[in-house]
């Protein structure tokens, strides 16, 4: 008889899972010098111990202690750059300025990046067929409790001058519902960090306007000035250049706006 | 400059009580997991106690029952209060913070020793 199984609304794990985050580790640690001591096979066991068993609506970040410690990684407080509904942009851009770091350039990103995962109560089973989707099932599910936890603790982390990349493009260019909105700008600590600077990444080839005037844009400085940091904003007006500009900032076409 | 600065070790008599305190400067102690961590001559360094940012904790068997952390963000102050000592913790007691971007910080540590 085969075994009843709770159908979630969401896709199920990414197929290979296991071995996906095991070799990512690897390769991770085989790039990265400084966590070259990092052991991937405790690190998956941790990965697998914060979701395996649990009902996949009743994770904690308390589950995934045991893999935050093991994922330590200083990343330098003032090099990081946030993103909100533009990742690859955000990505392209630590890929060339390699001296700033997104969430998935850290070792944990990095493991996580684009997958799902879930477990099942009370079985040691992953569950490949569906996972609980954030709307329609349960917010407390593995993979957003996952990011919840590391984004926060990667916001926590930042000081000086921390760089948010935001799409321009969006109707909410900022949106207090995603992760940026709702867990890193509440976890900035206002006695380490100075400022906040916005990038709006904008879309259209003839689209000059200043998107710093968005409302939601004014929003997010009203949040970010009522914890008592600093906010500027820089519209991006030609993404491609601003790449180009970044990989070649000594081009003649780099000293006016981009 | 991050320093932690562990204070109140000392000599004390099997079943008695000490209080341990670690001092944070230099970070914001909210942000950390905190834990205290022992080593006795010629063994490893282990796990006392720990107390996560969100103000879980936990404690290795030996001392469950005897040995209490706790933390206060507003002095960045964590303590671990020993009661019913025996000769077996006797050691070298450090303070350990903790974030999984932020960096790992140890204390000097402080001396414990528990003898008749």
């Known amino acids: 008889v085969p075994r009843w199984r709770q159908q979630w609304s969401g896709p199920g794990t990414t197929k290979r899972f296991p071995e996906t985050v095991l070799a990512r580790c690897v390769k991770y640690t085989e790039i990265h010098p400084e966590m070259r001591h990092v052991d991937c096979q405790s690190v998956w066991d941790a990965f697998k111990g914060a979701f395996i068993s649990k009902h996949p609506c009743n994770i904690t970040e308390e589950d995934y202690q045991p893999l935050m410690k093991l994922g330590t990684q200083t990343v330098p407080c003032n090099k990081i750059l946030l993103w909100s509904r533009i990742k690859d942009l955000a990505h392209q851009f630590t890929q060339v300025q390699r001296d700033m770091f997104t969430l998935e350039d850290t070792l944990l990103g990095y493991l996580a990046d684009d997958l799902t995962w879930c477990g099942e109560f009370n079985t040691s089973k992953i569950n490949y067929q569906s996972c609980p989707d954030w709307r329609k099932d349960c917010s407390n599910n593995p993979v957003s409790v996952f990011w919840k936890t590391v984004s926060r603790r990667f916001a926590e982390a930042a000081c000086d001058v921390v760089h948010v990349m935001l799409n321009g493009s969006r109707s909410k260019i900022f949106d207090k519902n995603s992760t940026f909105g709702s867990v890193e700008v509440h976890n900035l600590q206002p006695e380490k960090v100075q400022t906040l600077e916005a990038w709006v990444i904008h879309g259209g080839r003839e689209d000059s306007r200043d998107l710093c005037q968005d409302p939601t844009i004014k929003e997010l400085e009203s949040i970010i000035s009522k914890r008592n940091i600093q906010f500027s904003c820089k519209n991006i007006y030609r993404p491609d250049k601003f790449l180009q500009c970044v990989k070649n900032p000594e081009d003649s076409s780099c000293t006016s706006e981009i | 400059q991050v320093q932690l600065q562990e204070s109140g070790g000392g000599l004390v008599q099997p079943g008695g009580s000490l209080r341990l305190s670690c001092a944070a400067s230099?970070?914001?102690?909210?942000?950390?997991?905190m834990g205290w961590y022992r080593q006795a001559p010629g063994k490893q360094r282990e796990l006392v106690a720990a107390?996560?940012?969100?103000?879980?904790?936990n404690y290795a068997d030996s001392v469950k029952g005897r040995f209490t952390i706790s933390r206060d963000n507003a002095e960045n102050t964590v303590s671990l209060q020993m009661n019913s000592l025996k000769s077996g913790d006797t050691a070298v007691y450090y303070c350990?913070?903790?974030?999984?971007?932020?960096?790992?910080?140890w204390g000097q540590g402080t001396q414990v020793t528990v003898s008749s």
């Open positions: 350990n913070a903790d974030h999984t971007f932020a960096g790992v910080y």
């Open positions: 230099g970070i914001i102690l909210r942000i950390y997991d």
């Open positions: 107390i996560t940012s969100g103000g879980r904790t």
